[in-house]
């Protein structure tokens, strides 16, 4: 679960230890602030929950790629 350290900065202190299918993910954002202890990815899931994930993990990278492609594909 991400933590807001102030109004502008949200940090992750722990990562999910379980892979989530990309079908359950809606969007993501990267956390790169120097105010945070570690770089992270926050996924927003289909049920609007925010989950912290480790950007070094392959499933996280694959999921970000998939979500990027989804947003690039115009809906017909």
């Amino acid at each position: 679960q991400p933590d807001a350290i102030n109004a502008a900065v949200t940090c992750c202190y722990n990562f999910t230890n379980r892979k989530i299918s990309v079908q359950r993910l809606a969007s993501y954002r990267r956390i790169t602030s120097s105010k945070c202890p570690k770089e992270a990815v926050i996924f927003k899931t289909i049920v609007a929950k925010e989950i912290c994930a480790d950007p070094k993990q392959k499933w996280v990278q694959d999921s970000m790629d998939h979500l990027d492609k989804q947003t690039q594909t115009p809906k017909t």
């Epitope: 379980r18 892979k19 989530i20 299918s21 079908q23 359950r24 899931t45 049920v47 609007a48 929950k49």
Partner: antibody, heavy 119, light 109 residues
């Protein structure tokens, strides 16, 4: 500890409807769903459908489409399964089971409700 | 709809023996979203394994799951008297379309 408590056994006439309830306690309701699974005497498990609470819409197995209605009342943490146009083949134990919408395995189950359809 | 086929239908073994149960899917089960349940007579099913190989809380180490794609296995390394039951596999790739296998009964030889 999460607990799912279902309503009691029912005896119904062919052609009628039955509504089974499933009350959840001891856990968060928001990003979880409830599935309904039935088991006819001596048979295997059959998924009927499910509902994710914050979506307020249910999904149904094709076999039950049009005959089953699954609803949830977040204020009372209770899910309901209504099956209409009952026939003798609907005699079964009906289970509710909880799942996390991020995954899907059924981690907690109700005790089951026996529905007998007989004229 | 993904169809799950379990084999064998019945497995007759003695306590202490190893049980190997198979579950084959008609389509690729992405993300290994497959679970195994144990059901004893008159009881609700109990989750044993999720994500193909992760043991649920409180499940003894003699139960293990493996597999990916279309072929999955539940192994009970050494059967205890309380393990004689029916076992079901379940896929949960799509939240709108879960399916179960037809079950494997593990009975005492």
């Amino acid at each position: 500890q999460v607990q799912l408590v279902q309503s009691g056994a029912e005896v119904k006439k062919p052609g009628s409807s039955v509504k089974v309830s499933c009350k959840a306690s001891g856990g968060t309701f928001s990003h979880y769903g409830i599935s309904w699974v039935r088991q006819a005497p001596g048979q295997g498990l059959e998924w009927m459908g499910g509902i994710i609470h914050i979506f307020h819409t249910a999904n149904y197995a094709q076999k039950f489409q049009g005959r089953v209605t699954i609803t949830a009342d977040e204020s009372t943490s209770t899910a309901y399964m209504e099956l209409s146009s009952l026939r003798s083949e609907d005699t079964a134990v009906y289970y509710c089971a909880r799942y996390d919408a991020h995954y899907g395995e059924l981690d907690f189950w109700g005790q089951g409700t026996l529905v007998t359809v007989s004229s | 709809e993904i169809v799950l086929t379990q084999s064998p239908a019945t497995l007759s073994l003695s306590p202490g023996e190893r049980a190997t149960l198979s579950c084959r899917a008609s389509q690729h089960v992405s993300d290994a979203y497959l679970a195994w349940y144990q059901q004893k007579p008159g009881q609700a099913p109990r989750l044993l394994i999720y994500d193909a190989s992760d043991r649920a809380e409180g499940v003894p180490a003699r139960f293990s799951g493996s597999g990916s794609g279309t072929d999955f296995t539940l192994t009970i390394s050494s059967l205890e008297p309380e393990d004689f039951a029916v076992y079901y596999c379940h896929q949960y790739i799509h939240l709108h379309s879960f399916t179960f296998g037809q079950g494997t009964k593990v009975e005492i030889k």
